[in-house]
Amino acid sequence: MMTGTIETTGNISAEKGGSIILQCHLSSTTAQVTQVNWEQQDQLLAICNADLGWHISPSFKDRVAPGPGLGLTLQSLTVNDTGEYFCIYHTYPDGTYTGRIFLEVLESSVAEHGARFQIP
């Protein structure tokens, strides 16, 4: 039975050229996390497997960094980075938990909603 819940940073915004941390947290379960996939619509950005560690898509290697923890740091943001991001937690024995984050990359400095998760 799946008892856990995924908490995410929710809807966030950041400035063009800046950085942001996409973060999900699995709570209320003792299940072991075997793998986390970070996906953006139809693309696999990164995968973190408990045995293999992190693998980042070459298309994003220059702008994506693993962590902190099981989160993902996006750098040198562009307006094209606006959209939905999904953290998919594969766990044993519970199964799969999915969290959704919507990121809006803004041209100007009106990114106050994402400030808590931005990297100076």
């Epitope: 075997t34 793998q35 996939n37 996906e39 995968i47 497997n49 408990a50 594969h90 044993y92 199964g95």
Partner: nanobody, 117 residues
Framework: EVQLVESGGGLVQAGGSLRLSCAAS????????MGWFRQAPGKEREFLAI???????LYADSVKGRFTISADNAKNTVYLQMNSLKPEDTAVYYC???????????WGQGTQVTVSS
């Protein structure tokens, strides 16, 4: 116990192609990720490609554009199509899978690929 069995390796000339297969046998369950790796003599194991249960893929820079990973979920089989092979692709090729009902990754026994010049 789930086992992974690779096949399709062999000797090929530079510029040629090979298609590797990796089949899961035994009490198989759904998988969340299957991938290909290789290890050349005296070198560390190298990541090549991963495919998720949602058919999303991720490649190493060294093989992107030359190698293609695909999967047949119904057969619990993953493939690696290797084109434009080079002598430096010579290695033992391994597949690995993360099954839903497993704490750890499962590895195959490997298949030898030799590319002659």
């Amino acid at each position: 116990e789930v086992q992974l069995v690779e096949s399709g390796g062999g000797l090929v000339q530079a510029g040629g192609s090979l298609r590797l297969s990796c089949a899961a046998s035994g009490p198989t369950f759904s998988w969340t990720m299957m991938g290909w790796f290789r290890q050349a003599p005296g070198k560390e194991r190298e990541f090549l490609a991963i495919i998720t249960d949602g058919s999303k893929t991720l490649y190493a820079d060294s093989v992107k554009g030359r190698f293609t990973i695909s999967a047949d979920n119904a057969k619990n089989t993953v493939y690696l199509q290797m084109n434009s092979l080079k002598p430096e692709d010579t290695a033992v090729y391994y597949c690995a899978a993360q099954f839903t009902l497993a704490r750890h990754l499962v590895w195959g026994q490997g298949t030898q690929v030799t590319v002659s010049s």
